[in-house]
């Protein structure tokens, strides 16, 4: 990896052992200023593999609310507006980082956690398994 | 929101002001034990709106490597295997949290940051804008 010289103005880290504990400023910086969030807001309905969005809430997690996509159909919508089972709707999943309160119910202490979320759905050609 | 009783075993938080600084344990807990990550690994190629994955690396960010999807075509792949512009390939985007080293190059001090990433692509019916 790239070795970066340490900034002499860094805060001291007491705990040098692994698991590593770091300081995190929760005042979120949003890098998405140039993007229009409305742009993709209706894709879930216009897609040939449409999906519904389900709210997943967990007060012990940060962010506490995550939206989970569930494909509406097993097949994809064809040109006639019918569900075509020659194609498959599948969820596109992504691993994301969240903060889990640890110990539980603590406002200022967290542990990093990886979770898998479904972001939307796409239409794929099915893999045909032939029986010998 | 839900009010949670504070755990008496929580670490003390010195900084009560906003921006709030919290302690985070970077020993990642992976909740994805029941899922097979290989499952969706070839969707990018089998989709009617296929995509390429581009590596985005930033040593000042945690995680330092993020994979960004870019749709291969503006149209979608039809049954004949041609790119059909009567339908549109679009990226499915998701806002995710990352940690940004702050001050720069510090190993133990971060700020939470929201970034928008494209996870994959889906095929949508285009909105036809008629000129008056």
């Amino acid at each position: 990896g790239i070795t970066i010289p340490r900034n002499p103005g860094c805060p001291n880290s007491e705990d040098k052992n692994f698991p590593r504990t770091v300081m995190v400023n929760l005042n979120i910086h949003n890098r998405n200023t140039n993007t229009n969030p409305k742009r993709s807001s209706d894709y879930y309905n216009r897609s040939t593999s449409p999906w519904n969005l389900h709210r997943n809430e967990d007060p012990e997690r940060y962010p506490s609310v995550i939206w989970e996509a569930k494909c509406r159909h097993l097949g994809c919508i064809n040109a006639d507006g019918n569900v075509d089972y020659h194609m498959n709707s599948v969820p596109i999943q992504q691993e994301i980082l969240v903060l889990r309160r640890e110990p539980p119910h603590c406002p200022n202490s967290f542990r990093l956690e990886k979770i898998l979320v479904s972001v939307g759905c796409t239409c794929v050609t099915p893999i045909v398994h032939h029986v010998a | 929101g839900i009010t949670i009783p504070r755990n008496p075993g929580c670490p003390n938080s010195e900084d009560k002001n906003f921006p709030r600084t919290v302690m985070v344990n970077l020993n990642i807990h992976n909740r994805n034990t029941n899922t097979n990550p290989k499952r969706s690994s070839d969707y990018y190629n089998r989709s009617t709106s296929p995509w390429n994955l581009h590596r985005n690396e930033d040593p000042e960010r945690y995680p330092s490597v993020i994979w960004e999807a870019k749709c291969r075509h503006l149209g979608c792949i039809n049954a004949d295997g041609n790119v059909d512009y009567h339908m549109n390939s679009v990226p499915i985007q998701q806002e995710i949290l990352v940690l940004r080293r702050e001050p720069p190059h510090c190993p133990n001090s971060f700020r939470l940051e929201k970034i928008l990433v494209s996870v994959g692509c889906t095929c949508v019916t285009p909105i036809v804008h008629h000129v008056a």
Epitope: N36 | C71, L74, I77, Y85, S89, H129, H130
Partner: antibody, heavy 118, light 112 residues
Framework: EVHLKESGPDLVAPSQSLSITCTVS????????VHWVRQPPGKGLEWLVV???????TYNSALKSRLSISKDNSKSQVFLKMNSLRTDDTAMYYC????????????WGQGTTVTVSS | DILLTQSPLSLPVSLGDQASISCRSS???????????LHWYLQKPGQSPKLLIY???NRFSGVPDRFSGSESGTDFTLKISRVEAEDLGVYFC?????????FGSGTKLEIK
């Protein structure tokens, strides 16, 4: 350096077929798409067809029945075949590289002149 | 098919002048992904076209900053802030949002 060069016959008889080759260098056909565009003498530009980096194609539907496009990645060549030529197919034929993700034609060949005449 | 109407057909200018070329589309060129695939090319006499501007306002590599592109709905404009001798030729707008990809009929930039 990116380079595209068209090669083919100067003269084709009406009702015959035309085959043109675009030989590229400085980039791979597995990474970039290639378009064919033509320009009749003293006129504007007409887009014909594109073969994308993944081998998929998109045709101008007005000409699709007479056109076919293919490529050989290992030889860095793209092939255009046009059937049932008419005198109004007389034009300069260009191949051009697709600007990946921007869908513009960023580099063009010098063109090859095709005259349809008996 | 999308019709791109360019005006003027001919634009006589003096060197150092500003030049402005218009391209009007018969339909919106905004793709579902939010991008507008309208490009500008210059074809000098006896040469193949060269890409100047892609996606409305992005200058292609090596293109001088005197060239700029803008849009207002379905009206697109190419501006040359100070015309130089090497800028003379025929300018084409082109769209790749819809198939078939189409070109405008061209605007000939010439010396007054």
């Amino acid at each position: 350096e990116v380079h595209l060069k068209e090669s083919g016959p100067d003269l084709v008889a009406p009702s015959q077929s035309l085959s043109i080759t675009c030989t590229v260098s400085g980039f791979s056909l597995t990474t970039y798409g290639v378009h064919w565009v033509r320009q009749p003498p003293g006129k504007g530009l007409e887009w014909l067809v594109v073969i994308w980096s993944d081998g998929l194609t998109t045709y101008n539907s007005a000409l699709k029945s007479r056109l076919s496009i293919s490529k050989d990645n290992s030889k860095s060549q793209v092939f255009l075949k046009m059937n049932s030529l008419r005198t109004d197919d007389t034009a300069m034929y260009y191949c051009a590289r697709d600007y990946t993700y921007e869908y513009a034609m960023d580099y063009w060949g010098q063109g090859t002149t095709v005259t349809v005449s008996s | 098919d999308i019709l791109l109407t360019q005006s003027p057909l001919s634009l006589p200018v003096s060197l150092g002048d500003q030049a402005s070329i218009s391209c009007r589309s018969s339909q919106s060129l905004v793709h579902s992904n939010g991008n507008t695939y309208l490009h500008w090319y210059l074809q000098k006499p006896g040469q193949s076209p060269k890409l100047l501007i892609y996606k409305v306002s992005n200058r292609f590599s090596g293109v001088p900053d005197r060239f700029s592109g803008s849009e207002s709905g379905t009206d697109f404009t190419l501006k040359i802030s100070r015309v130089e001798a090497e800028d003379l030729g025929v300018y084409f707008c082109s769209q790749s949002t819809h198939v078939p990809f189409t070109f405008g009929s061209g605007t000939k930039l010439e010396i007054k």
